[in-house]
């Protein structure tokens, strides 16, 4: 079976304050079973940005329908960007476990930085 790869094609994403940013993430395999979460930063200080399974993330929408059985696109859009949103964003695959899911693999990350100011 093919080993799972987490693909985040953009190393750097320049965004404009007040606009919407699209962060891309695709996976190469449906296995192992488990959710994909988005974080900003790494280690214990990382910030949870999106979890499809629980929580309410009002500024985040998914590009694809994550409920579809064979979905491999976990890209997200973050609306109304502010300077506090800058940082490196990672899509992270978790393996379904009991009682908790276990982190399995992370994408390489996309750095979000502020580009041109709104005119």
């Amino acid at each position: 079976e093919e080993e799972l790869q987490m693909i985040q094609p953009e190393k750097l994403l320049l965004v404009t304050v007040g606009k919407t940013a699209t962060l891309h993430c695709t996976v190469t395999s449906l296995l192992p079973v488990g959710p994909v979460l988005w974080f900003r930063g790494v280690g214990p200080g990382r910030e949870l940005i999106y979890n499809q399974k629980e929580g309410h993330f009002p500024r985040v929408t998914t590009v694809s329908d994550l409920t579809k059985r064979n979905n491999m696109d976990f890209s997200i859009r973050i609306s109304s960007i502010t300077p506090a949103d800058v940082g490196t964003y990672y899509c992270v695959k978790f393996r379904k476990g009991s009682p908790e899911n276990v982190e399995f693999k992370s994408g390489p990350g996309t750095e979000m930085a502020l580009g041109a100011k709104p005119s």
Epitope: E47, N51, E54, G55, F57, P58, R59, V60, S80, A84
Partner: antibody
């Protein structure tokens, strides 16, 4: 319904310690950043500290840095504020407040816990 | 650090009249401004976020406007239960999160 209930307030002498707790219910506690905000008698609101959803990222107001420690137990849905080396100017009602998303305002507040520091 | 200045400090308004509260930021905060209401002896309650969006369960007599550095909270027809202190909060730059000094609304 979201509920935040603080406990642990009381009267202490300058230099002493106190630990506040905030029991959360009605939402996915582990998905949200949480904050402590205080209000001295007859004064306005002062942000004290923030902790990210996972518990590994913390921020503090300059006035409490090095003396106060924020923490959380996601398995118990509880937020804490350990207050050491208390001063008279720390006398206030301390509110725990849920954050709307990782970079947002406070959408729910607890009822508050009164901390009095007096010799 | 962004400083939020609220005016007036106290506002006396008769029931049924309009109340207009101001919050000015020392630098732009885009639309990232919230308003909280605090009645005497109670915890704060969120009224408005993103400058103009009403929080869940907030009556439509409360409205917010503005962007950048100048913001307004309007209570279109003041009710006796609206007697409270109103605070603005910015969340464009943080930490720290900043609140304005508050405006006390009194019923004439």
């Amino acid at each position: 319904d979201v509920q935040l209930v603080e406990s642990g307030g009381g009267v202490v002498r300058p230099g002493e310690s106190l630990r506040l707790s905030c029991a959360a219910s009605g939402f996915s506690f582990s998905s949200y950043a949480m904050n402590w905000v205080r209000q001295a008698p007859g004064e306005g609101l002062e942000w004290v500290s923030r902790i990210n959803s996972g518990g590994g990222g913390t921020d503090y107001a300059e006035s409490v840095k090095g003396r106060f420690t924020i923490s959380r137990d996601n398995s118990e849905n509880t937020l804490y504020l350990q207050m050491n080396s208390l001063r008279a100017e720390d006398t206030a009602v301390y509110y725990c407040a849920k954050q709307y998303d990782w970079n947002g305002f406070f959408d729910y507040w607890g009822l508050g816990a009164l901390v009095t520091v007096s010799s | 650090e962004t400083v939020l200045t609220q005016s007036p400090a106290t506002l006396s308004v008769s029931p049924g009249e309009r109340a207009t509260l101001s919050c000015r930021a020392s630098q732009t905060v885009g639309s990232k401004l919230a308003w909280h209401q605090q009645k005497p002896g109670q915890a704060p309650r969120l009224l408005i976020y993103d400058a103009s969006r009403r929080a869940t369960g907030i009556p439509d007599r409360f409205s917010g406007s503005g962007s950048g550095t100048d913001f307004t909270l309007t209570i279109s027809s003041l009710q006796t239960e609206d007697s409270a202190v109103y605070y603005c909060q910015q969340y464009y730059y943080w930490p720290p999160y900043r609140f304005g000094g508050g405006t006390k609304v009194e019923i004439k």
